[in-house]
């Protein structure tokens, strides 16, 4: 296993609709054809997997149908979008990139993007 540098923004504010997008960029030492991207969430010292996708270079990322993540790739960049976020989902989202094929296997883990999520203010009751 060889190490690889992964860069991501330090902090992002999700939209009022609970959507957060950020780029995860990796310094590929070689010409990988198969890449796996995993998003991990760290909160209160617990790390959980949010979503993961394996893709062939030049193809779209395919997450599971029920995944809250979508993404696109361009060269050594992956543009990740996480949706359905609520205030309680605020936390550190870490991008993990694995170059699966061809060998050698490379692993890179970013420092994480702190995503802040603000629940929208409830609309005041109105009489019609």
């Amino acid at each position: 296993c060889k190490a690889m540098h992964v860069a991501q923004p330090a902090v992002v504010l999700a939209s009022s609709r609970g959507i957060a997008s950020f780029v995860c960029e990796y310094a590929s030492p070689g010409k990988a054809t198969e890449v796996r991207v995993t998003v991990l969430r760290q909160a209160d010292s617990q790390v959980t997997e949010v979503c993961a996708a394996t893709y062939m270079m030049g193809n779209e990322l395919t997450f599971l149908d029920d995944s809250i993540c979508t993404g696109t790739s361009s060269g050594n960049q992956v543009n990740l979008t996480i949706q359905g976020l609520r205030a309680m989902d605020t936390g550190l989202y870490i991008c993990k990139v694995e170059l699966m094929y061809p060998p050698p296997y490379y692993l890179g883990i970013g420092n994480g993007t702190q995503i802040y999520v603000i629940d929208p203010e409830p609309c005041p009751d109105s009489d019609f």
Epitope: P9, A10, V11, V12, L13, S15, A87, T90, I118
Partner: antibody
Framework: QVQLVQSGAEVKKPGASVRVSCKAS????????ISWVRQAPGQGLEWMGW????????NYAQKLQGRVTMTTDTSTSTAYMELRSLRSDDTAVYYC?????????WGQGTTVTVSS | EIVLTQSPGTLSLSPGERATLSCRAS???????LAWYQQKPGQAPRLLIY???SRATGIPDRFSGSGSGTDFTLTISRLEPEDFAVYYC?????????FGQGTKLEIK
């Protein structure tokens, strides 16, 4: 070194608007947020809101909603805070600060005086 | 909104003594997203502690933070002359990101 430099003092009449700038250097501007905090003479700190320089999304204090606008110009690594319909109780020192976990780097402050 | 109440309002101590400052929240602070700042007259605030207990870069180890939920504490183990200032707590877990009213630490 990491630095935030704010624009100079302003004197405004009630009802006018003010725009304070905050120029960042020494770090990747789009990787962080910029918070705005004000402090009236002899008073404590009041959080006004923040903007994610990465995507331009904003979160404002409800009491200022509709009067405040925070923006960024990523080409010059500068954040702006505009406050409209100024009142005498808006007289304060306005600070910008880099935000991630709390506010770790602060500007020097901009004094805004609202007086007729 | 979360109201942060700091106590005492003023604390009079001598250099070398231990200072304990309290910050109480009206409801639980999400993930202990609580910061402490120091402010001296005519200066911008300075971040001391974030995440309730993590020291910011360049902050001496005589400053420590603790607590979770609704009760948080800033401790200065041995006061230096330059520590006399106003201290603010702030929660940044739930919008709006409110500040406490401050504790003034003065020389006895």
């Amino acid at each position: 070194q990491v630095q935030l430099v704010q624009s100079g003092a302003e004197v405004k009449k009630p009802g006018a608007s003010v725009r304070v700038s905050c120029k960042a250097s020494g770090y990747t501007f789009t990787s962080y947020g910029i918070s705005w905090v004000r402090q009236a003479p002899g008073q404590g700190l009041e959080w006004m809101g923040w903007i994610s320089a990465y995507n331009g999304n904003t979160n404002y204090a409800q009491k200022l909603q509709g009067r405040v606008t925070m923006t960024t110009d990523t080409s010059t690594s500068t954040a702006y805070m505009e406050l409209r319909s100024l009142r005498s109780d808006d007289t304060a020192v306005y600070y910008c600060a880099r935000f991630i976990y709390g506010m770790d780097v602060w500007g020097q402050g901009t004094t805004v005086t609202v007086s007729s | 909104e979360i109201v942060l109440t700091q106590s005492p309002g003023t604390l009079s101590l001598s250099p070398g003594e231990r200072a304990t400052l309290s910050c109480r929240a009206s409801q639980s602070v999400f993930s202990s997203y609580l910061a402490w700042y120091q402010q001296k007259p005519g200066q911008a605030p300075r971040l001391l502690i974030y995440g309730a207990s993590s020291r910011a870069t360049g902050i001496p180890d005589r400053f420590s933070g603790s607590g979770s939920g609704t009760d948080f504490t800033l401790t200065i183990s041995r006061l230096e002359p330059e520590d006399f200032a106003v201290y603010y707590c702030q929660q940044y877990g739930t919008s709006p990101y409110t500040f406490g009213q401050g504790t003034k630490l003065e020389i006895k």
